[in-house]
């Protein structure tokens, strides 16, 4: 028996991956469990094995096809089940009808690079990964810059309310090491959430020219 709450949460990356987490507070799962996906209008079923990510949560990825293939649409519904082995049979632990485009979480942006750097400014670009063409331009971004002596949590968030895959950081300090991260979110979906943060991009501003203010 479970004393606390349990939760089964899944997100679609908009192309060919559904990532799921099954958690049970106060439960020790000593049996094998899996997630099973049964779409309403596709000929495939898919299963992944839940693997521990912490003491009380397990995760897996339903790989639906090649990374950039469009495996689901806005009208698809996928019935998702958590199944755990109980003796010789599988027992359903959780179930839901999953609307992929209501539960989106994209992959973290990739290919971050410094386009141009000056003493007080830096222009950075990035790319989105495995994002559906259905979104067209309906995406937004959040970015943050890590300054010396601060933590990521302290960094103010910069919001880009459009599909803009670059940013010009201003009012930087000359000859200073910074790090930069960005994340993306579609505008669509009641339960849609931000992507993970990108890998940090480290850069250094140029030193100020001696005897001259730039």
């Amino acid at each position: 028996a479970v004393n606390g709450t349990s939760q089964f949460t899944c997100f679609y990356n908009s192309r060919a991956n559904i990532s799921c987490v099954w958690s049970q507070d106060g439960a020790l799962q000593d049996t094998s469990c899996q997630v099973h996906a049964w779409p309403d209008r596709r000929r495939w079923n898919q299963t992944c094995e839940l693997l521990p990510v912490s003491q009380a949560s397990w995760a897996c990825n339903l790989i639906l096809g090649a990374p950039d293939s469009q495996k689901l649409t806005t009208v698809d519904i996928v019935t998702l089940r958590v199944l755990c082995r109980e003796g010789v049979r599988w027992r359903v632990m959780a179930i839901q009808d999953f609307k992929p485009f209501e539960n989106l979480r994209l992959m973290a942006p990739i290919s971050l690079q410094v386009v141009h750097v000056e003493t007080h400014r830096c222009n950075i670009s990035w790319e989105i990964s495995q994002a559906s063409h259905y979104f067209e331009r309906h995406l937004e971004f959040e970015a943050r810059t890590l300054s010396p002596g601060h933590t990521w949590e302290e960094a103010p968030l910069l919001t880009l309310k459009q599909k803009q895959e670059w940013i010009c950081l201003e009012t930087l300090t000359p000859d200073t090491q910074y790090e930069f991260q960005v994340r993306v979110k579609p505008l669509q979906g009641e339960f849609t959430t931000w992507s993970p943060w990108s890998q940090p991009l480290a850069f250094r501003t140029k030193p100020a020219a001696l005897g001259k203010d730039t």
């Epitope: 519904i77 019935t79 009808d97």
Partner: nanobody, 125 residues
């Protein structure tokens, strides 16, 4: 949020059948998994079964599997629990419940946010 109301309970003889209804009002019914739990006198509330938002998926407690069947009519905001081959151990108060919108249904009553008042089912031998 969603409000839930059970009906259809009563007295039935062992081996008989009964159909319970769970009527919902409030938020969009088709966003919610609906589950049934029951509580016998002096016992803890136990999971009976759950049905997904569209009705495509169901699962049941092993004690009722093959005897109880869940169905739903989203246009009428109602879930039905058809109970066949009833026995005295099925006696109790039957509650329908829902987790938060978009959440999965589980066997754990702690995961459910919305509850009806319950309807009494008594199976006599």
């Amino acid at each position: 949020q969603v409000q839930l109301q059970e009906s259809g309970g009563g007295l039935v003889q062992a081996g008989g059948s009964m159909r319970l209804s769970c009527a919902a009002s409030g938020r969009t019914f088709s966003n919610y998994v609906i589950a049934w739990f029951r509580q016998a006198p002096g016992k803890e509330r136990e999971f009976v079964g759950a049905i997904t938002q569209t009705g495509r998926g169901t699962f049941y407690a092993s004690s009722v599997e093959g005897r109880f069947t869940l169905s739903r009519l989203n246009d009428q905001s109602t879930v039905y629990l058809q109970m066949n081959s009833l026995n005295p151990e099925d006696t109790g108060v039957y509650y329908c419940s829902a987790p938060r919108s978009g959440r999965a249904g589980t066997r754990n009553q702690m995961d459910y946010e919305y509850w009806g008042q319950g309807t009494q089912v008594t199976v006599s031998s």
